[in-house]
Amino acid sequence: SIPWNLERITPPRYRADEYQPPDGGSLVEVYLLDTSIQSDHREIEGRVMVTDFENVPEEDGTRFHSQASKCDSHGTHLAGVVSGRDAGVAKGASMRSLRVLNCQGKGTVSGTLIGLEFIRKSQLVQPVGPLVVLLPLAGGYSRVLNAACQRLARAGVVLVTAAGNFRDDACLYSPASAPEVITVGATNAQDQPVTLGTLGTNFGRCVDLFAPGEDIIGASSDCSTCFVSQSGTSQAAAHVAGIAAMMLSAEPELTLAELRQRLIHFSAKDVINEAWFPEDQRVLTPNLVAALPPSTHGAGWQLFCRTVWSAHSGPTRMATAVARCAPDEELLSCSSFSRSGKRRGERMEAQGGKLVCRAHNAFGGEGVYAIARCCLLPQANCSVHTAPPAEASMGTRVHCHQQGHVLTGCSSHWEVEDLGTHKPPVLRPRGQPNQCVGHREASIHASCCHAPGLECKVKEHGIPAPQEQVTVACEEGWTLTGCSALPGTSHVLGAYAVDNTCVVRSRDVSTTGSTSEGAVTAVAICCRSRHLAQASQELQ
Amino acid sequence: QEDEDGDYEELVLALRSEEDGLAEAPEHGTTATFHRCAKDPWRLPGTYVVVLKEETHLSQSERTARRLQAQAARRGYLTKILHVFHGLLPGFLVKMSGDLLELALKLPHVDYIEEDSSVFAQ
């Protein structure tokens, strides 16, 4: 029967006794930077070309006897997971292997850099179709390794890496922390995060998604027909590299941003038991398990968005946190979150010719996060309209006044330390979808976009009594672009988007004291693109 | 994921550029920084990636590497250029004593220097 991991990544409509996805990734080349591999294994024979690249450190140990089969173990298994005949994800993909890890699975940042440079030079000398680079390795945070990954990604290469097996924040490791790389954590057959002894999968905001990574059957280097089960975030990354190869084979023109958005969009949502993660990391860690798209074509009509969390600002009074979108994504909204509730809101601002989302800590706060909503919106023209704090008691308001511009997100930022101690906030007048309204002490920022066929609407969910969480979701066919809270009172910790749902978090009910200021409204802005839908219909 | 400018959990040693008698001294006030792995056991002291500013050409990288070797030799230090990078990042990989870091950070075109460190199969 089909191994659990291949079943897990197969969309329900294709599930059968055999794993036979529609496209095997035949137009894509996958580079594997790992140990040496047994290229004559029946699973991968004729599919993997061993390059002459080798850059590895000496083995550790007072007595080291290397058996070829042991040296090849990790790389052979991963090559099998990506493209193996029987147990592989992308059975049609061709692979090239570079040896950057020694027989003990140890390498160096410098060896990995030289390997990445080798790939770039190969790409320049002999341009082929789409390239995927699988980096099933991790070391401590490295500025230079992240920079090299960024350069290679900007040259059109898709990099997929292991989040790391340290049961730790993936942002402390490289290349997992590189924003341009697709970083993959590991889950098991029960959709639990993978435990590896005392350790386990990494987590946090630097992880893009999870994939099967425990008890994965694949090629064993013990013999040319042997199979073995291995576990780790390398195995998870290999699944995503295989899925990416299949998506790129079906749509070779996909950019990295488009591929990442599709991987997120087609993932299984909210199936991971978050209790495994440390409490402070749960909100930052994506609850996504990778899966193949139900159809390899026809996803182009969708308006794709993802949520990007910043690093924590730190606790100093004037500390800020910045969340950025990828170069070919549009920042459609910006929100903020603080566990202590002490924050001074957020604003969208231009930095290096691109909008970023900046959140502001408040005096006595433990720090804030900025949360960017990053979307694929071709031919978009977006701008931020700001209204300074209002003199009148009615509150501050700002709207999209340019012809054809629609509201995609609202942010508010205030200089006073605690809005809750000032005049009571106003409620938003209804029936004005193109308008952001907020506290009179705050400046309000509206994200206004013009794009062919873009339409948006505001959806609200208010709760009169205090509650720790209020949510509002966009309906099928609409995509969440903006998420904010009304009113901006002191007990609101912040707002953020999880998939297509806007979440507004408030302080624990028992600590808020007075219930008079308890009303909280979650405001979602839901958009869709008729233009993309029409373009997709014309293609079909 | 990690901000590009968010040099996360690293030791950063910033040293002011000084003329040091160089013909091509860096602009006054610019600082090259030194980075190393926050996890001590994974550090590989003695091998360094010297990363040069973005638009540096291969010939300039090679010249900067040779200059480092010459200046190190004048101070009685042996160095070995293990690799010259081009195609992704301009720079070079050098085997040298950590005593030479201050000197290397003052070289023209240097953006930052990172001590080599280990990576592991996951």
Epitope: G61, Q67, L196, G197 | P41, F120
Partner: antibody, heavy 122, light 111 residues
Framework: QVQLVQSGAEVKKPGSSVKVSCKAS????????MHWVRQAPGQGLEWMGL????????YYADSAKGRFTISRDNSKNTLYLQMNSLRSDDTAVYYC???????????????WGQGTTVTVSS | QSALTQPPSVSGSPGQSVTISCTGT????????VSWYQQLPGTAPKLMIY???KRPSGVPDRFSGSKSGNTASLTISGLQTGDEADYYC???????????FGTGTRVTVLG
Amino acid sequence: QVQLVQSGAEVKKPGSSVKVSCKASAFTFDSFGMHWVRQAPGQGLEWMGLLWSDGSGEYYADSAKGRFTISRDNSKNTLYLQMNSLRSDDTAVYYCARAMGAIYYYYAMDVWGQGTTVTVSS
Amino acid sequence: QSALTQPPSVSGSPGQSVTISCTGTSSNIGNQFVSWYQQLPGTAPKLMIYEYNKRPSGVPDRFSGSKSGNTASLTISGLQTGDEADYYCGSWDSSLSGYVFGTGTRVTVLG
């Protein structure tokens, strides 16, 4: 649950040999390095040696070099400590312990056996 | 193998905090990860802290580790009677190519 079960107590004469075993259960034995540690009566912990997960690399304490050999049979999920030329000061409780994770954390011990008492006395 | 240096004993009343130091050299604590182990009377040691300051799941957050230079420390806050045990630090030593343990510290809970 995850455990290491060691063989029973041994009483040996000086100059003789003994082989202590440690059987692993409920974890993938061949993914973990393994240590031996001993504790003489009323004394502290003394590390004896470490064997790589696949048996390909090893380290020994000076006091174990030449006389003690660590081996493993991954098909039986079992680790062994062969002790030759026993001396009275080898009298101790011998613990096997699992190395935490792969090569990057081989040196912390996260699961311990219950201990095997080896008494060397004439 | 020369051991890392720990105080033979420390004591405190229930609810108090105690700190155990572990001093080594640049070839062990200074440049290697440090672990801490608890050994209750008559039992095998148990890992409490690894990589200076990380706790395996199941270890209470009353136990915390830190490192400065060639010295590592284990702090037990909110001391409980069940914490009475011997505590050992441990670190790889790159010059010996071997693991070294501390001399051990007995923690006594008064009263």
